[in-house]
C-alpha cells in the first residue's frame, strides 16, 4: 500500500503519500477552529508509470495504452485512496462544539 | 457533472472528461478479444483550480491551501469518478464466451 509506512521510509518519485502539515490560520485563513491549530493532512503526488498501483481496470488499461503509445497524454494520476476524519473543537459564541470533519487526512494513495 | 454532456460540448481546460477510443489490438496488443474491436474508454484530464469539482473535504482543503500557497506542489488531480463495464466476446479455443469487464469506461471526472 502507498501509505506512510511505505512512502515515508522510501525515497519514491512515483505516486506516493507525501507529508503535509496544514496550519489552519496561516495556510487556510481559518480562524474559527480552536483546536487543533493544524494537522497532518498529507497529500498524494508522483508519477504513475506502467501499472504502478493502478486501482481500476480502466487505469490499468490506460497505463498499458500509455506504454504502447508513449506520445499519448492520457495517463493515470496520483490521488488519495484511504481518508480519515479529523476531530476539531470550535466555538459557537461561547459554546464549545466538537465536530468530526470527514475525509480530512489522506492515509494512502493510488493511481487512478 | 464533469461528464460527456458537459465536457464534450464545452472547450474546457479544467478537469473534464476527454474522449479516447482504444483499439484492443493496436493500442493494447490484445488479440484475445473478438468483439468489440475497440471501445470508447475516455479519460480524465485538465487543471484542478480552486474548488473545481472537488470531491472530498481533503481535496477542497488542498485546493484552498494551493490558492493561499501558490508555490506549493500539493494540488488536487483530475481523475475518474463514475465508471461503467464493457461487455466483450472472446473465444476459449472454438467456444465463444461473453464476459462483462468491470470499470472499463469512464463516464465522469472529479478533482481528488
Amino acid at each position: 500500500a502507498l501509505d506512510a509506512a511505505y512512502c515515508f521510509r522510501n525515497v519514491q518519485d512515483n505516486c506516493c503519500l507525501r507529508p503535509l502539515y496544514i496550519d489552519f490560520k496561516r495556510d487556510l485563513g481559518w480562524k474559527w477552529i480552536h483546536e487543533p491549530k493544524g494537522y497532518n493532512a498529507n497529500f498524494c503526488a508522483g508519477a504513475c508509470p506502467y501499472l504502478w498501483s493502478s486501482d481500476t481496470q480502466h487505469s490499468r488499461v490506460l497505463s498499458l495504452y500509455n506504454t504502447i503509445n508513449p506520445e499519448a497524454s492520457a495517463s493515470p494520476c496520483c490521488v488519495s485512496q484511504d481518508l480519515e476524519p479529523l476531530t476539531i473543537l470550535y466555538y459557537i459564541g461561547k459554546t464549545p462544539k466538537i465536530e468530526q470533519l470527514s475525509n480530512m487526512i489522506v492515509k494512502s494513495c493510488k493511481c487512478s | 457533472a464533469l461528464d460527456a454532456a458537459y465536457c464534450f460540448r464545452n472547450v474546457q481546460d479544467n478537469c473534464c472528461l476527454r474522449p479516447l477510443y482504444i483499439d484492443f489490438k493496436r493500442d493494447l496488443g490484445w488479440k484475445w478479444i473478438h468483439e468489440p474491436k475497440g471501445y470508447n474508454a475516455n479519460f480524465c484530464a485538465g487543471a484542478c483550480p480552486y474548488l473545481w469539482s472537488s470531491d472530498t473535504q481533503h481535496s477542497r482543503v488542498l485546493s484552498l491551501y494551493n490558492t493561499i500557497n501558490p508555490e506549493a506542489s500539493a494540488s488536487p488531480c483530475c481523475v475518474s469518478q463514475d465508471l461503467e463495464p464493457l461487455t466483450i466476446l472472446y473465444y476459449i479455443g472454438k467456444t465463444p464466451k461473453i464476459e462483462q469487464l468491470s470499470n472499463m469506461i469512464v463516464k465522469s471526472c472529479k478533482c481528488s
Epitope: R60 | L28, W30, K31, W32, Y91, I92, G93, T95, L101
Partner: antibody
Framework: EVQLVESGGDLVKPAGSLRLSCVAS????????MSWVRQAPGKGLQWVGY????????NYADAVKGRFTISRDNAKNTLYLQMNSLRVEDTAVYYC?????????????WGQGTLVTVSS | ETVLTQSPGTLSLSPGERATLSCRAS???????LAWYQQKPGQAPRLLIY???SRAPGIPDRFSGSGSGTDFTLTISRLEPEDFAVYYC?????????FGQGTRLEIK
Amino acid sequence: EVQLVESGGDLVKPAGSLRLSCVASGYTFSSNVMSWVRQAPGKGLQWVGYVIPIVDIANYADAVKGRFTISRDNAKNTLYLQMNSLRVEDTAVYYCTRTLGLVLDAMDYWGQGTLVTVSS
Amino acid sequence: ETVLTQSPGTLSLSPGERATLSCRASQSLGSSYLAWYQQKPGQAPRLLIYGASSRAPGIPDRFSGSGSGTDFTLTISRLEPEDFAVYYCQQYADSPITFGQGTRLEIK
C-alpha cells in the same frame, strides 16, 4: 529478446505449499495471455492453466483446480503459480509460457523450467 | 477432454532422410488449432508450427505441418543431426489444452 525466467522450485512435503515466479522481459508483458505447463520426470507435457492480462481471468486444468492459483504482477512483469495442498503427482518441471495471442493458443516462448519435487 | 495420439512412438531414421510424424485427435479440431513442438533433453520445448501449418519465426523451412479435422502431420523434409529430439503436438481448440504423448525421433 523475449525471456522468461522461472524460480521458486523446491523439495516440499505432501500437503505443503510453494509459490513459483516467472519474470518476463523483452516484450510488453500485459499484452499476452500467460500459461503454466508442467512435465513430470520422463513424461509428457501437461497444461496447468492460464491467466489473461489486466482483467486477470484465469482457468485451470481439473487436476489442479482449487489447489493452484495463477496470478500476475503486471508492474513487476511477473507471473506467479501458488501451489497449495501439494501431492506426490504434482512433482514435475514447471514451465512458464507466453501464448501467441488468443486465450487458448500455441506457446511461442517458454522459460527454462523450475523443478518441484513433492516427497515425504 | 480432447485426447491426442501420436504415432509412431519412436521413429528411427538417418540424417538426410524424410520424417513423417502423425497426430490424431479424438474429436475434430477444425483446421487451425494444432501446434507442434520440439524438445531436446534438459531443454524447454520449442514451438515449430502453429495453426496446423504456419511455421514459427526462425524455424527452418524443412519443417512443415499439414492436416485438419482429426488428422495432422509434421514433416521434416531432410533430417539434420540437430533434429533428433522428442516432438509433441498440442491442441487448443478446446479447454483444457492437451498434448500428445510425444514421438521420439532417433538416429538409426
